[in-house]
């Protein structure tokens, strides 16, 4: 088997759709499988077409985290297997967070993950830097939420509240839709009181470049950059 066209690497924003192409040839026509970070691809759709002993495989992905995607072309001559591999990386571009970029609209929170955490019938800010803000923000929370399953019972509820109120920020009443960031003091309480051990481990891994998952790139606020409740009590949200 021989790969004629390898998938290309992409640097995209969270919530983007990406199509990876892989074209291979051989006698007999090879089969193509896709691997994501060493495992079978868990999500995404695959379309294939075969023409003149050439197989073309297209993997469409909804990007919620960085990853290494490998195209493996395999065919069999008698008892002998022939394999060719080509890989591409998907990285998530740093994006301007809602509190820095107030492009968006306000709507009632219609999701599920943060329903028990947010205020009842919460009106939240949806960031239009995403193609589908509701779906993208919900997916971001959902992905990060799964990582919280391993933290301590003391940390978890505090971290969930911080996560939901950071990604689905309260919408400020006014003529321009504006997100209300979490108050610095509440963020620090989660970081230094409820989740001190977990935060330390996470920051250490991030600094060593071992752990750059989407939760840490996008989901956790930098407490020092948040407004203090002592500056203006209405300028930030209390958890």
């Amino acid at each position: 088997a021989r790969i004629l066209r390898a998938p290309e690497s992409h640097n995209v924003t969270f919530g983007s759709f990406v199509t990876l192409h892989c074209t291979a040839t051989g006698i007999p026509v090879p089969t193509i499988t896709w691997i994501e970070n060493g495992n079978a691809v868990s999500s995404g759709s695959i379309q294939e077409s075969v023409k003149d002993r050439v197989i073309d495989s297209r993997l469409q992905l909804f990007i919620t985290k960085p990853g290494l995607y490998t195209c493996i072309a395999t065919n069999k001559h008698g008892e002998k297997f022939s394999t060719a591999k080509a890989a591409a990386t998907i990285s998530i571009a740093e994006w301007s967070k809602p509190q820095k970029d107030n492009k968006g609209y306000c709507a009632q929170y219609r999701g599920e993950v943060c329903n028990a955490v947010l205020a009842k019938d919460a009106l939240v800010f949806l960031n239009t830097s995403y193609a589908d803000p509701e779906e993208a923000q919900e997916l971001l929370v959902h992905t990060a939420w799964n990582e919280l399953k391993v933290v301590s019972p003391v940390c978890r509820p505090a971290a969930e509240a911080l996560l939901c109120n950071h990604i689905f920020q309260e919408c400020s009443p006014g003529v321009v839709p504006t997100p209300i960031p979490i108050c610095r003091e509440y963020c620090l309480a989660v970081k230094e009181l409820f989740c001190a051990k977990e935060w330390l481990v996470m920051e250490e891994k991030t600094h060593r470049g071992l752990y750059r998952s989407e939760m840490h790139l996008l989901s956790v606020p930098e407490c020092s950059k948040l407004p203090s409740m002592h500056w203006d009590p209405t300028a930030c949200a209390r958890l």
Partner: antibody, heavy 118, light 108 residues
Framework: QVHLVQSGAEVKKPGASVKVSCKAS????????MHWVRQAPGQGLEWMGW????????SYAQKFQGRVTMTRDTSISTAYMELSRLISDDTAVYYC???????????WGQGTMVTVSS | SYVLTQPPSVSVAPGQTARITCGGN??????VHWYQQKPGQAPVLVVY???DRPSGIPERFSGSNSGNTATLTISRVEAGDEADYYC???????????FGTGTKVTVL
């Protein structure tokens, strides 16, 4: 100053359609959902549906599904509500309303009287 | 679909307190809003999110919500408070907005 200004009164025959407009000013039109509410003479308020002016997405009350169409023109900050296959029971005042950063409707249009009569 | 029930009418003497109820299944888990509507006019929001008041609405208007009943309270009632009052909620399960049946407040 925040305003919602609606189109004028309409008289329609049964079976016809009516299209009511609602022009927003004084706030970011694409930032907040626009709702439509109607009130038949001597009756209560009835929610018809909403449109997300940013995306054009809509949600309609079951009662009006298939008969109502909500659209918007962001270039002129205007929302529209079209009701088709009119019957005499559709005679009502039609309001557009929005909530600027709260979950309630804190701004309302002045209302448009639609009369359906043969 | 979610139903909100209000008494058709409430009568109150000037200076007294009027209480308007709004009944709904587990309404306490929802945010309740109240509107005042005078004849020939568009509704005006008087209380939102159970008990918050928009700017310009007198402190005489207050709200509460728990269990299966939400209440709008108008203290020291004035003649100008005579109007129809509607409660309203967002029904999350259907993503529909629901109004109560309305209550006519008469100032004696």
């Amino acid at each position: 100053q925040v305003h919602l200004v609606q189109s004028g009164a309409e008289v329609k025959k049964p079976g016809a359609s009516v299209k009511v407009s609602c022009k927003a000013s004084g706030y970011t039109f694409t930032g907040y959902y626009m709702h439509w509410v109607r009130q038949a003479p001597g009756q209560g308020l009835e929610w018809m549906g909403w449109i997300n002016p940013y995306s054009g997405g809509t949600s309609y009350a079951q009662k009006f599904q298939g008969r109502v169409t909500m659209t918007r023109d962001t270039s002129i900050s205007t929302a529209y509500m079209e009701l088709s296959r009119l019957i005499s029971d559709d005679t009502a005042v039609y309001y557009c309303a929005s909530g600027l950063g709260i979950s309630a409707f804190d701004i309302w249009g002045q209302g448009t009287m639609v009369t359906v009569s043969s | 679909s979610y139903v909100l029930t209000q008494p058709p009418s409430v009568s109150v003497a000037p200076g007294q307190t009027a209480r308007i109820t709004c009944g709904g299944n587990n309404i306490g888990s929802k945010s309740v809003h109240w509107y005042q509507q005078k004849p020939g006019q568009a509704p005006v929001l008087v209380v939102y999110d159970d008990s918050d008041r928009p700017s310009g609405i007198p402190e005489r208007f207050s709200g509460s919500n728990s269990g299966n009943t939400a209440t709008l309270t108008i203290s020291r009632v004035e003649a100008g408070d005579e109007a129809d009052y509607y409660c309203q909620v967002w029904d999350r399960s259907s993503d529909h907005y629901v109004f109560g049946t309305g209550t006519k407040v008469t100032v004696l």
